[in-house]
């Protein structure tokens, strides 16, 4: 009976999310394998988040709006492990917007989700950021490694969206 009611709850939750995400990919987790964590298909999952690589070339503002429409934000990178996971799925000859910007050019970098900007957990390429005119951050492959660079916000780039996993 308990299992039945849990299944019914899950199904109603799935139906609720169905209007936003036509397809969800879910995995069982938790100590009793009772919880399901889901990401929209074909998003990828890492820890408690889902990631989507958009190959549509858009400005930073339009990229953030695009993520927002999907219930996400441009990616906020909190650890080296997270960055290493993300970059596995990126093309080395492309650049991708991050959810990191300096809208006033004061070198006060800010994440879109208001996560505090921690200088100790940043992955700027050597010599970057290097221009107060360049107020948005990308991740790209340079000098044999992935890192961040500041660029003009209105120059179209690919982008990475991030959202919290859906738990049902």
């Amino acid at each position: 009976n308990f299992m039945y009611s849990k299944t019914v709850k899950r199904l109603s939750k799935l139906q609720e999310y169905q209007q936003y995400y036509p397809s969800l990919t879910c995995v069982m987790e938790g100590k009793d394998m009772e919880d399901w964590s889901c990401c929209p298909t074909p998003w990828t999952s890492f820890q408690s988040s889902c990631y989507f690589i958009s190959t549509v070339m858009q400005s930073w503002t339009k990229s953030q709006n695009n993520c927002s429409v999907m219930g996400a934000d441009l990616v906020v990178i909190n650890t080296k492990e997270e960055q290493d996971f993300i970059t596995q799925n990126l093309k080395i000859n492309s650049a991708y917007f991050l959810g990191l910007s300096d809208p006033k050019g004061w070198r006060h970098w800010q994440w879109v989700d208001q996560t505090p900007y921690n200088k100790n957990v940043t992955f700027w390429h050597s010599g970057e950021p290097n221009s107060p005119d360049e107020r948005c951050a990308i991740i790209n492959f340079r000098s044999e490694e992935w890192g961040w660079n500041d660029v003009h916000c209105h120059v179209p780039q690919k982008s990475i969206c991030k959202m919290k996993k859906i738990y049902i």
């Epitope: 858009q58 400005s59 930073w60 503002t61 339009k62 953030q64 709006n65 910007s101 809208p103 006033k104 050019g105 290097n130 221009s131 107060p132 005119d133 360049e134 107020r135 948005c136 660029v151 003009h152 916000c153 209105h154 120059v155 179209p156």
Partner: antibody
Framework: EVQLLESGGGLVQPGGSLRLSCAAS????????MSWVRQAPGKRLEWVAT????????YYPDSVKGRFTISRDNSKNTLYLQMNSLRAEDTAVYYC??????????????WGQGTTVTVSS | DIVLTQSPDSLAVSLGERATINCKAS??????????VNWYQQKPGQPPKLLIY???NLESGIPDRFSGSGSGTDFTLTISSLQAEDVAVYYC?????????FGGGTKVEIK
Amino acid sequence: EVQLLESGGGLVQPGGSLRLSCAASGITFSTYTMSWVRQAPGKRLEWVATINSGGDNTYYPDSVKGRFTISRDNSKNTLYLQMNSLRAEDTAVYYCATYRPYYYGSVLDYWGQGTTVTVSS
Amino acid sequence: DIVLTQSPDSLAVSLGERATINCKASQSVDYDGNSYVNWYQQKPGQPPKLLIYGASNLESGIPDRFSGSGSGTDFTLTISSLQAEDVAVYYCQQSDEDPWTFGGGTKVEIK
């Protein structure tokens, strides 16, 4: 007083090359992102190229990508536009302009007087 | 590309009267409370001159008879009391996304 002086325009045959220069004074040139904008006779203004202050990032519209190259020499306070494989539709007055950011966008605040490029056989 | 359509193509206004120029973008050029549209004035044989940035901010040194308004896709440049020296072509421009694009221009003359 800010002054931007373009030079290097002239008459060139289709397929030919030309190098435009823009000498800047009255500004700390090395701190400015710079752009080229052109205006064909009777047509609207068209953005052609942008280069950041350090010269390591350059941007172009599809109409000139692969044919035009923007560069700068901060020691000489000079901006350049190398134009190759010129076409009749590249005929225009070419202006250099300083770029000023505005949040996530920008404005072109100071403009030179322009130099005329005519592509014709 | 974002297309900017200006109207009217030309405008004849009496001295001291109001002139209004419209600019319509093919998609929104707003983000987080700012609009990325600028207005320029170009007199014959001269380069363009920045008048208004961010849709409504008056550039330093520009007379306050010039004003800008609008958001999203619809923007307006107003000259509250036309002076003889305002005879020129006026262009809107968007800087929200490359390639930067300009409107086709509006020629303002004296009636």
